[in-house]
Interface confidence: low
Amino acid sequence: DAHKSEVAHRFKDLGEENFKALVLIAFAQYLQQCPFEDHVKLVNEVTEFAKTCVADESAENCDKSLHTLFGDKLCTVATLRETYGEMADCCAKQEPERNECFLQHKDDNPNLPRLVRPEVDVMCTAFHDNEETFLKKYLYEIARRHPYFYAPELLFFAKRYKAAFTECCQAADKAACLLPKLDELRDEGKASSAKQRLKCASLQKFGERAFKAWAVARLSQRFPKAEFAEVSKLVTDLTKVHTECCHGDLLECADDRADLAKYICENQDSISSKLKECCEKPLLEKSHCIAEVENDEMPADLPSLAADFVESKDVCKNYAEAKDVFLGMFLYEYARRHPDYSVVLLLRLAKTYETTLEKCCAAADPHECYAKVFDEFKPLVEEPQNLIKQNCELFEQLGEYKFQNALLVRYTKKVPQVSTPTLVEVSRNLGKVGSKCCKHPEAKRMPCAEDYLSVVLNQLCVLHEKTPVSDRVTKCCTESLVNRRPCFSALEVDETYVPKEFNAETFTFHADICTLSEKERQIKKQTALVELVKHKPKATKEQLKAVMDDFAAFVEKCCKADDKETCFAEEGKKLVAASQAALGL
């Protein structure tokens, strides 16, 4: 499959529109601070060059790798040193080190202004005036804020974004039509970004085999009728796609993802009965649909797992001959029988099974040694089941906002060194597990909850990695990908933490809080709650509840006052004094 010119190959495969969009995403994910106009200029130059290579693959520089071409282009940016500091040193390196260097400088929390949504009429005018620029700007703004966003999926989001404006800008009530669609795209986009970030962290921090193990388990749950060999082929191809996207090879990634969707649809009879509708859709919708497709029904009369993996006298022989294949088969067989388990639980079971075989196959009587291995699974299964039961009960009792607050207090006490914005963001997202998963029946709760928590805790891990402040977070994040959640769950109050000095400024509020949306007001209150816990880690739930109730009443009272600012100043002092007294600060 060798091509004289890689850039010509990808241009022809993807078409000009997708080629330009993907190059823009790639550049914006690498150089997150560069102005939009600079990126557009670079993309246009690359596109013109690609066209010359399509016309003549032997033309000068057309044989260069995409990393070389794109890296050379990025290194022409005049302000690289001033804007990015040490990232400019990447340009002194040769490929592949240069690309690795760019990847290492991707920033999960770039210092960029919050995206403020203009008035609907303003957006519709901009959309009509220059649709192409408007959509490019969307790709650019999302890509630079989410440097690991799954690029082919971002094309799908852009397509939906365009459809929303096309439809709603001609509607009688533009805002009523457009705003819910934009909210939905924003929320789905954040979720998509976080899910992809976990895939990239899995590949980059724990290696290809970690990702493959995850993929075997997930695809076996989704396609339980598919043969092991079929699942293995899909895992290999899916791993290639995500390795490319996480490595910045977005053209190859999008091309290979399209090939994988094509293969799945051509072979759906041997994969899943649930793919029919997906496979009738256009490419971007098809790929998205396949990625989200519901689990197929389990085949009837699957035999007991014990026969092949415990009772057989050939267990150690089969394991020794091909450890990877044997463990892969175990994971496949277990996962296809258990759509009710989370992927991380399935991986913990596989790890336990592997550890047992490593020990027992070297023992005098291997069969006797591993005969009870499935008994070791019971506590591993019960732990997440019990945790989810307890937390769903708490969620149903408190509602989302107060459930988030309970988690805020819990996690601030566990890891008080973590920055307040990170604790608020992560705990709010952890709290969303309630409304997302607790409504499901028992059989769907664990895969929903624990795999979602893995995604959220990965956000904590990547944000913490940028500025590490807690050994406990580092330990839970790096020791084992599949045990991150149990590791955080097991953390108790950090007794070594020295409480923060009290700073009245932290608890000073102004009238601007009254004009905030309900969500932003909640974030303000939750920020104050985290700070309270950091000042008084030993505060009881009752003490914190009393202070937060007073705080809510204070905000409500002052937002109704005629002179709001004076109210906030005077009542705020009283509130701080009362809170200090209540907490013994």
Epitope: F206, G207, R209, W214, K323, D324, S480, V482
Partner: nanobody
Framework: EVQLLESGGGLVKPGGSLRLSCAAS????????MNWVRQAPGKRLEWVSS????????YSADSVKGRFTISRDNAKNSLYLQMNSLRAEDTGVYYC???????????????WGQGTLVTVSS
């Protein structure tokens, strides 16, 4: 029989450089992720760096990032660690170690070398 043999250790001044090598035999080297692990005198083992089977993925501990570079030559069944800007705290026995797990979602090693001593002192 699986064998891992490290070499290249020695005494070096702070700021200096060393290149460690690990010669592998007795297994298909190109199928395995490989690692460097070290143990400072009186301290626990510390993972230093790992490289995937084809050499496409490289991960390093924060303490050595930007100073140490892991690499491999599958044709020569060899693993390397280029150590630059050495510091006193880099002193210790350096081991090369094989990662056995085909579905390895954790850092775990099944075979180790006997180690090579690196001493950084003025």
């Amino acid at each position: 029989e699986v064998q891992l043999l490290e070499s290249g250790g020695g005494l070096v001044k702070p700021g200096g450089s060393l290149r460690l090598s690990c010669a592998a035999s007795g297994f298909t080297f190109s199928n395995y992720n490989m690692n460097w692990v070290r143990q400072a005198p009186g301290k626990r083992l510390e993972w230093v760096s790992s490289i995937s089977s084809a050499g496409t993925h490289i991960y390093s501990a924060d303490s050595v990032k930007g100073r140490f570079t892991i690499s491999r030559d599958n044709a020569k069944n060899s693993l390397y660690l280029q150590m630059n800007s050495l510091r006193a705290e880099d002193t210790g026995v350096y081991y090369c170690a094989r990662d056995p797990h085909s579905t390895g979602w954790y850092k775990d090693f099944d075979y180790w070398g006997q180690g090579t001593l690196v001493t950084v002192s003025s």
